[in-house]
């Protein structure tokens, strides 16, 4: 069973001092990561017993294995059902505590009732404050039965449940009609899935005979021991004030376990700690009684004395539960109550015995759950004991269960049952997860779900290049941490697998499924610099850059140009997908904007160092385009352009700019300024004869405006080759007069 205890502090004079604590003795309890088990949960369950809403309860975690619920403000906050959930996977277990109001009309004689399948359960509600109305019994919040108030027997209302079955389990309550539900008596009925002394599917297996009030679990046959007892059969008492499956926990406070209710996994339920009894667990056991709720009687023989926590304390020369066994009878010594081995291992098990006559090797035997008897391979004889060593054949899962060491001499015999747990080494069910990658390293999460048994002691990560026949590289890591695989090859696929191990010899599990993880490209290392930039318009910018010359091929797929508009907090990114490119035209920019510009080389998804930034101010948006542009050849080297001023000007034009381009030519266009803005005509001179030209123009106020329509015109023929176009400007009217 899961080592989970829910403690309720029953000092009820002040609800603010009341607390519930859930303690787990499980390895790795409450660590909270998916692979190693969810955390402990402690909460009030309002599904059946609803109480008025109050301030939320406070949950405090103390390390990984303890959680405490506080913040109760009034007595009604305490009434109802509380549950603690712990353990991982199939071992996830819920422990339930039912709290009754000490001032209720009806009080349970006994809150927890654990019965066997087919038994008759009797719930008894004692009258604390009488009302002359019906008593309504409910099961899990639904109506179950009615009793007339005259039907009380000796001041108690009894509910008899004959032939109970597991579905009858749950929370029962007895309430006077018309009374507040908080005045009810609340009970918990636990019905074991088997008849008395049996467990397992079909209830075919025999329980180990739990001592000291331990209850046999109907699924696994283990004894759920009362608080303060330990061992496979609960045969050993803990020291006063201790509890937990291995007596590893200590009751808080100076008065030990006084005033505490202990709730354990079903089918145990709840009780006071060992040595205490009463509805608030504050009364010490009467003489001759001991154990949880003082339910056990000592009946010590041969001068033994009764200790209310542990039972009979035997004088020298005697042992046994009632000091009924003479020390002359052989006795198994210090046998562990539980042993754990991994599947397919061949462990050695030791069994020590003493007695008079002295036990010898042949008088000690080991019996497996299937009845097979093993004889010891060697024995170590010491003055006070003989230790027999047994070599166990390769373990299979069916070897899980109760083994028995038995010693027989002419003085009598003794046997000690102990539990052997055969654990299955863990095997990952999934491949590890890639978290991040670089060119020479991979960061991997090895935490995966697994089949088999925990806890996980080590995680091995095996990896090698894909399609490689070389040996696997292995790294051993802490189960809870991510792993970085270093010194890998860039742009290479690696096969990665996880291997999990649990404690003990043979605890290594099979390798999990492989997964392919690929390292990134090499990072580009070259830093470009900006050679220059040229404003081609209010929203266009031509940028050029260079790279340092280095030997070998260029590591890069292209360039990323970044323009940062600090005023608007916006970034523009332009991808240049050729690593040979050294210039780019950026369009669609915002006129009148101050940009910070840089360029980076990229390779795959990796960016190299950015160039030192440049600061570029785009001119504000200019005026509309000039209208009705017209070209007229005047000679073999001159063409006259005429136009009309743009409409709706935002201010006075400072100049016009004419663009001249040979039609079909590959060269850059030529820009010529017309510095007299009042002009509506200009002559472009120095052109080549018999050549077709394209012209367009735009005005400038604070910034350049939109381009006009493009016009075509050819110079007249047979002139000499000119040196290049120039312009002469005059008013349109004057040109026409000439």
């Amino acid at each position: 069973a899961v080592d989970l205890t829910l403690l309720a502090n029953l000092r009820l004079t002040d609800p603010q001092r009341f607390f519930l604590t859930c303690v787990s003795g499980e390895a790795g309890a409450g660590r909270g990561s998916d692979a190693w088990g969810p955390p402990l949960l402690l909460e009030k369950d309002d599904r059946i017993v609803r109480t008025p809403p109050g301030p939320p309860l406070r949950l405090a975690r103390n390390g990984s294995h303890q959680v405490t619920l506080r913040g109760f403000s009034k007595p009604s906050d305490l009434v109802g059902v509380f549950s603690c959930v712990g353990g991982a996977g199939a071992r996830r277990t819920r422990v339930i505590y039912v709290h009754n109001s000490p001032g209720a009309h009806l009080l349970p004689d006994k809150v927890t009732h654990t019965v066997n399948k087919g038994d008759t359960a009797v719930l008894s509600a004692r009258v604390h404050k009488e009302k002359q109305t019906d008593v309504i019994w409910k099961s899990n919040g639904s109506y179950f039965y009615t009793l007339d108030w005259h039907e009380a027997q000796d001041g108690r209302f009894l509910l008899q449940l004959p032939n109970v079955q597991p579905p009858s389990s749950g929370i029962y309550s007895a309430t006077y009609l018309e009374a507040s539900p908080l005045g009810s008596a609340f009970f918990r009925l636990i019905v074991r899935g088997c008849g008395a002394g049996r467990w397992g599917p079909g209830c075919t297996k025999e329980c180990p005979g739990c001592l000291h009030g331990g209850v046999c679990h109907d699924h696994d046959g283990e004894c759920v021991c009362p608080p303060g007892f330990t061992g496979t059969r609960c045969e050993q008492a803990c020291r006063e004030g201790r509890f937990g499956q291995s007596c590893q926990e200590q009751c808080p406070g100076i008065s030990g376990c006084r005033g505490l209710t202990f709730c354990l996994p079903d089918p145990y339920g709840c009780s006071c700690g060992s040595g205490w009894r009463g509805s608030q667990c504050q009364e010490a056991c009467a003489p001759g009684h001991f154990g949880a709720d003082c339910r056990l009687q000592c009946q010590c023989q041969n001068g033994g004395t009764c200790d209310r926590f542990s039972g009979c304390v035997c004088p020298s020369g005697w042992h046994g539960v009632h000091c009924e066994k003479s020390d002359r009878i052989p006795q198994i010594l210090n046998m562990a109550s539980e042993l754990e081995f991994n599947l397919e291992t061949m462990p050695r098990i030791n069994c020590a015995a003493a007695g008079n006559p002295f036990p010898v090797r042949g008088s000690i035997e080991l019996r497996k759950p299937d009845g097979t008897v093993l004889l010891s391979t060697k024995a170590i004889v010491e003055p006070e004991k003989t230790t027999a060593e047994f070599e166990v054949p390769r373990l299979v899962l069916a070897d899980s269960g109760f083994w028995e060491c038995r010693v027989s001499t002419s003085g009598g015999q003794d046997s000690r049952r102990f539990k052997v747990n055969v654990k299955v080494p863990p095997v990952p069910l999934a491949a590890p997860r890639l978290l991040t990658k670089q060119s020479r390293q991979l960061v991997v999460s090895p935490l995966v779900s697994f089949s088999g048994d925990g806890p996980i002691s080590t995680v091995r990560l095996h990896y090698r290049p894909q399609d490689s026949t070389m040996d696997w590289s292995t790294i051993v890591v802490d189960p809870s941490e991510n792993v970085t695989l270093m010194n890998l090859r860039p742009k290479t696929g690696y096969s990665v697998r996880v291997q999990l191990s649990r404690p003990g010899e043979g605890g290594e599990g099979a390798w999990g499924p492989p997964t392919l993880m690929t390292t990134d490209c090499p990072e580009p290392l070259l830093q470009p610099w900006l050679e220059g930039w040229h404003v081609e318009g209010t929203d266009r910018l031509r940028v050029s850059w260079s790279l340092p010359l280095v030997p070998g091929p260029l590591v890069g797929d292209g360039f990323l140009l970044r323009l940062w508009d600090g005023t608007r907090g916006q970034e523009r990114r332009e991808n240049v997908s050729s690593p040979q490119a050294r210039t780019a035209l950026l369009t669609g920019l915002t006129p009148g904007t101050h940009y910070q510009l840089d360029v980076q080389l990229y390779h795959c998804t990796l960016l190299g160092p950015a160039s030192p930034p440049a600061h570029v101010l785009l001119p504000p948006s200019g005026p509309p385009a000039p209208r009705h542009l017209h070209a007229q050849a005047l000679s073999d080297s001159e063409i006259q352009l005429t136009w009309k001023h743009p409409e709706a000007l935002p201010g006075p034009i400072s100049k016009y700019v004419v663009e001249v381009q040979v039609a079909g030519g590959a060269g850059d266009p030529l820009w010529i300024d017309v510095d007299r803005p009042e002009e509506t005509s200009t002559i472009i001179r120095g052109l080549n004869a018999s050549t077709r030209y394209l012209f367009r123009m735009r005005a400038s106020i604070q910034g350049l405006g939109d381009w006009s329509n493009t016009v075509e015109e050819s110079t007249l023929g047979n002139g000499l080759q000119a040196e290049g176009p120039v312009q002469e400007s005059r008013a349109a009217e004057e040109g026409l007069d000439q």
Partner: antibody, heavy 119, light 107 residues
């Protein structure tokens, strides 16, 4: 489906006796309080008697006390009303009714059986 | 014994109208009151319990109110199938007692 089916009504002379039965099905009969309620022709409803789930406690209206006896057989899921010393004013349709979960109101009623006391 | 008095004895209304039925207890019964509907030749049917809670399957046009000694059953818009006799019943103490009934008939 919850069903209650009364039987045993009929014509009886004053001073005579009759035993009514109510067969229950569709629910756990042994958990519920059961009642008899009657309705004289053209008149309103009148509560007659109640019996607790265990059968250990019964109550009666003053008008029938000492003459009528309510009982139940939980193994047969049947409710009974033994009526002795019948009077003309006992003429009515007799209904058995289930009390909802110890609450006091009736969530299921039988179809009724007519008892006529006349000479 | 607690006496239950219903008024009026008869209520003549048209479909679509609002019906208000009254029930008075001779002493306080808290909210321990149920209302039943009975049509000719049929068995009583539970409408309301605990003075104001609608029973399963009862339309929302039926509502109950009151506590102590005075209680009301309201049918917000009468449907043709609502014309019947209505009884109140107290279950605050034994013996259980019913009102004499209110007949809701078509005007």
């Amino acid at each position: 489906e919850v069903q209650l089916l009364e039987s045993g009504g009929g014509l009886v002379q004053p001073g005579g006796s009759l035993r009514l039965s109510c067969a229950a099905s569709g629910f756990t009969f042994s958990k519920y309080k059961m009642h008899w309620v009657r309705q004289a022709p053209g008149k309103g409803l009148e509560w007659v008697s109640v019996i607790y789930p265990s059968g250990g406690k019964t109550y009666y209206a003053d008008s029938v006390k000492g003459r009528f006896t309510i009982s139940r057989d939980n193994s047969k899921n049947t409710l009974y009303l033994q009526m002795n010393s019948l009077r003309a004013e006992d003429t009515a349709v007799y209904y058995c009714a289930r009390e909802m979960g110890g609450s006091g109101w009736y969530d299921y009623w039988g179809q009724g059986t007519l008892v006529t006391v006349s000479s | 014994n607690i006496q239950m008095t219903q008024s009026p004895a008869t209520l003549s209304l048209s479909p679509g109208e609002r019906a208000t039925l009254s029930c008075r207890a001779s002493q306080s019964i808290s909210s321990y009151l149920a209302w039943y509907q009975q049509k000719p030749g049929q068995v009583p049917r539970l409408l309301i319990y605990d003075a104001s809670n609608r029973a399963t399957g009862i339309p929302a046009r039926f509502s109950g109110s009151g506590s102590g000694t005075d209680f009301t059953l309201t049918i917000s818009r009468l449907e043709p199938e609502d014309f019947a006799v209505y009884y109140c019943q107290q279950y605050g103490s034994l013996p259980r007692t019913f009102g004499q009934g209110t007949k809701v008939e078509i005007k």
